[in-house]
């Protein structure tokens, strides 16, 4: 009678997570009887997966009947996987024992590789807004994949950024990988739109990558350019200055006239217009009273955006060739508004 | 340490019934086929019943003399084994073994102590 | 059913000597290459003790001086050498087919 002998035919076994992994075994003889256990890892710390005589496995259910007369397969199906099952699994025959059984011989062993999809990409930026011609670095991470291979791809409106840096941890073995990638973006004025995209391409995901998106809109900063005008007398003794408040973002802004350094009125962008690209213009007009004035007038429009330290822009209203109105107390009378409400 | 603990046996009329138990204990009770087998001067030793796993769907089989009288059956919460007998005849005399089945082909490696059936009138 | 025939019903044997019973089935009892016999010791209020599994194959915890041989139909017990302690009734049993049955027993006693 030949020695029984443990044949574990398949040297590794890949499944994906969720599915069930089907591990097989078979012995060549009922004899010795005793148990086929089943354990994950070699040596004196090795874990117990099923024990076909003591014990309780609900997650693992035999191949075949293993009460059938003459049974010599003892393959095993654990339900459920995660990346946590990922190991070198051991069909191992005991020998009967009193009082307790003695290992008789092991199977060479199935390596149980657990494909895991890695999770969806989060893209963040920078806590702060940073203006156009600055470069900003963007950070994109994806955990719980597994095997390690990944591919990581930055995008800025559909062109592929090169300027990144990416780690996928931990660098030794591990039952699932993290990968965390930071990439550097140079902003235009024409950023309002555009998006950042992170790509990630996984054996798992077969051939549609997933994909995490940041706004610039939430990144750029594209500060106004400020146009002070004089128009044509609207009455013999009334100027109507504007101050045109262009290309700016995002939209929260307040505006400030000043005359003679003295502030005149302050007010907070409301109804703006849109460009095309995404920033915004807004106009604020004052209208002034030049018969209250003696001397020439410097009126300031000064904007205060997004929290930033003001900007503003002059205007010298010549006011000499203007004549004096006696006992008017109103140095001048104010009007805000926009393009659209013009009066 | 295996032990297997008969109960239940005692003097009985013919046509009576009995119900013997059997509770287990030392061995992860519902991975093992249960049997009873009895003994007695006249038959000698006589394999009476045998109930399989709830994966086997809990399939029993009886001795021919017992067939239709007896029902053998498993509480595997109770680590417990049973038979219940009915219209009992004196040749049903004998001691009754709980006996576990080690390797699902009659392998009777742990026997009970046996408990004593008498049907006598 | 299988009926299984022991012989001899009993035997005494000098202590040190080899004993030899005898089971014979009334039909085979191998399958796939195994024969599903099983040889058992009983001693005066006791229930029977197992020491061969398969017609060959000692039982944890048995003394190597039994030993089981045969296939088929015809199956042996030794027992060598004999020691005091081995006085007792030994049965065979067979798990061919349904019912399982035992053989009559052989009561073995020491000279």
């Known amino acids: 009678e030949e020695e029984l002998q443990v044949i574990q035919p398949d040297k590794s076994v890949l499944v994906a997570a969720g599915e069930t992994a089907t591990l097989r075994c078979t012995a060549t003889s009922l004899i010795p009887v005793g148990p086929i256990q089943w354990f994950r890892g070699a040596g004196p710390g090795r874990e117990l997966i099923y024990n076909q005589k003591e014990g309780h496995f609900p997650r693992v259910t035999t191949v075949s009947d293993l009460t059938k007369r003459n049974n010599m397969d003892f393959s095993i199906r654990i339900g459920n996987i995660t990346p946590a099952d990922a190991g070198t699994y051991y069909c191992v025959k005991f020998r009967k024992g009193s009082p307790d059984d003695v290992e008789f011989k092991s199977g060479a062993g199935t390596e149980l590789s657990v494909r895991a999809k890695p999770s969806a990409p989060v893209v963040s930026g920078p806590a702060a807004r940073a203006t156009p011609q600055h470069t900003v670095s963007f950070t994109c991470e994806s955990h719980g994949f597994s095997p390690r291979d990944i591919t990581l791809k930055w995008f800025k409106n559909g062109n592929e950024l090169s300027d990144f840096q990416t780690n996928v941890d931990p660098v030794g073995e591990s039952v699932s990988y993290s990968i965390h990638s930071t990439a550097k973006v140079v902003l235009t004025r024409e950023d309002v739109h555009s998006q950042v995209i992170c790509e990630v391409a996984h054996v798992t995901l077969q051939g549609d990558p997933l994909r995490g998106t940041a706004n610039l809109s939430e990144t750029i900063r594209v500060p106004p350019t400020l146009e002070v005008t004089q128009q044509p007398v609207r009455a013999e003794n009334q100027v109507n200055v504007t101050c045109q408040v262009r290309k700016f973002y995002p939209q929260r802004l307040q505006l400030t006239w000043l005359e003679n350094g003295n502030v005149s009125r302050t007010e907070t962008a409301s109804t703006v217009t849109e460009n095309k690209d995404g920033t915004y213009n807004w106009m604020s007009w004052l209208l002034v009273n030049v018969s209250a004035h003696r001397d020439d007038v410097k009126l300031t429009c000064q904007v205060e955006h997004d929290g930033q330290p003001a900007v503003s822009k002059s205007h010298d209203l010549k006011v000499s060739a203007h004549p004096k109105e006696q006992g008017s107390n109103t140095a001048a009378e104010n009007t805000g508004s926009n393009e659209r409400n013009i009066y | 340490e295996v032990k297997l603990e008969e109960s239940g046996g005692g003097l009985m009329q013919p046509g009576g019934s009995m119900k013997l138990s059997c509770v287990a204990s030392g061995f992860t009770f519902s991975n093992y086929w249960m049997n009873w087998v009895r003994q007695s001067p006249e038959k000698g030793l006589e394999w009476v019943a045998e109930?399989?796993?709830?994966?086997?769907?809990?399939?029993?089989h009886y001795a021919e003399s017992v067939k239709g009288r007896f029902t053998i059956s498993r509480d595997d919460s109770k680590s417990s084994v049973y038979l219940q007998m009915n219209n009992l005849r004196a040749e049903d005399t004998g001691i009754y073994y709980c006996i576990r089945d080690y390797d699902y082909d009659a392998y009777f490696d742990y026997w009970g102590q046996g408990t004593t059936l008498t049907v006598s009138s | 059913d299988i009926v299984l025939t022991q012989s001899p019903a009993s035997l005494a044997v000098s202590l040190g000597q080899r004993a030899t019973i005898s089971c014979r089935a009334s039909?085979?009892?191998?399958?796939?290459?195994?024969?599903?016999m099983y040889w058992y010791q009983q001693k005066p209020g006791q229930p029977p003790k197992l020491l061969i599994y398969l017609a060959s194959n000692l039982e944890s915890g048995v003394p190597a001086r039994f030993s089981g041989s045969g296939s088929g139909t015809d199956f042996t017990l030794n027992i060598h050498p004999v020691e005091e302690e081995d006085a007792a009734t030994y049965y065979c049993?067979?798990?061919?087919?349904?019912?399982?049955?035992f053989g009559g027993g052989t009561k073995l006693e020491i000279k």
């Open positions: 039909k085979s009892v191998s399958t796939s290459g195994y024969n599903y």
């Open positions: 049993q067979h798990s061919g087919e349904l019912p399982y049955t």
């Open positions: 109930i399989r796993l709830k994966s086997n769907n809990y399939a029993t």
